[in-house]
């Protein structure tokens, strides 16, 4: 991953929420659900309405990066997806409001969002070689690739 000192120089400014109340499904069509207060996991659901709904906020980089940088919040909450280290679960961090500016160690709240057809990838800004991923019998975590699943489908709210 990129050196921390390099990342800490970049400032990210909040622009706007670009998606509301969407579901993330992995390549096995398992949906992301709440495992507990702190962690997420993936499971096959008999009703997709039971999946976690996310909002996505866009940030602009002071580096004028071409990548789309986003924050992921659980809809109707103040809980934000936060990266830890490789193979560690992502955490749900409570914050009173969406951060207006993010820099330094707080970049663990941010992800580069890439799309390839219907596949969506979320790379950690703090760990640019690691993706949000699902893993069998484990929490949603950060991983570099297989056997973890790193590509997701976004299911939009039709309401």
């Amino acid at each position: 991953s990129a050196p921390f000192s390099f990342l800490s120089n970049v400032k990210y400014n909040f622009m706007r929420i670009i998606k509301y109340e969407f579901i993330l499904n992995d390549a096995l069509n398992q949906s992301i659900i709440r495992a507990n207060d702190q962690y997420l996991t993936a499971a096959a659901l008999h009703n997709l309405d039971e999946a976690v709904k996310f909002d996505m906020g866009a940030y602009k980089s002071s580096k004028d990066d071409a990548k789309i940088t986003v924050i992921l919040r659980i809809s109707k909450t103040q809980l934000y997806v936060t990266a830890q280290d490789e193979d560690q679960p992502v955490l749900l961090k409570e914050m009173p409001e969406i951060p207006k500016t993010i820099t330094g160690s707080e970049t663990n709240l941010l992800f580069f969002w890439e799309t390839h057809g219907t596949k969506n990838y979320f790379t950690s800004v703090a760990h640019p070689n690691l993706f949000i991923a699902t893993k069998q019998d484990y929490w949603v975590c950060l991983a570099g690739g297989p056997p973890s699943i790193t590509d997701f489908q976004i299911l939009e709210n039709q309401a």
């Epitope: 579901i23 499904n25 659901l45 008999h46 009703n47 997709l48 299911l155 939009e156 709210n157 039709q158």
Partner: nanobody
Framework: EVQLLESGGGLVQPGGSLRLSCAAS????????MFWVRQAPGKGLEWVSV????????YYADSVKGRFTISRDNSKNTLYLQMNSLRAEDTAVYYC?????????????WGQGTLVTVSS
């Protein structure tokens, strides 16, 4: 007893439209994903679309995206599939199914099917 009864199939010309219906009974309809799947002559089952219990979330196979629309009326316990811009390759028996979003097998119940033939 769970029952799923499809209707609305028939012969239609390429570019035409059809609306399939599926009447459901025997379970709490609004608490389950519902699916449309199809089986073309001599082929295996192909998943077409899914809709969540409330109808708020839908997803489509790439082969039908932009042409087909899944919907449901929970007050009538009925699932629908609006099929537009039909092509010869859409010819199949269409089944509605109840079940998990992805399991092996993914569906715990499905109907007897309705035949859609797209031909000039």
């Amino acid at each position: 007893e769970v029952q799923l009864l499809e209707s609305g199939g028939g012969l239609v010309q390429p570019g035409g439209s059809l609306r399939l219906s599926c009447a459901a009974s025997g379970f709490t309809f609004n608490q389950y994903n519902m699916f449309w799947v199809r089986q073309a002559p001599g082929k295996g089952l192909e998943w077409v679309s899914v809709i969540s219990g409330s109808g708020r979330f839908t997803y489509y196979a790439d082969s039908v995206k932009g042409r087909f629309t899944i919907s449901r009326d929970n007050s009538k316990n009925t699932l629908y599939l609006q099929m537009n811009s039909l092509r010869a390759e859409d010819t199949a028996v269409y089944y509605c199914a109840k079940g998990w979003w992805r399991r092996d097998p993914p569906f715990d119940y499905w109907g007897q099917g309705t035949l859609v033939t797209v031909s000039s």
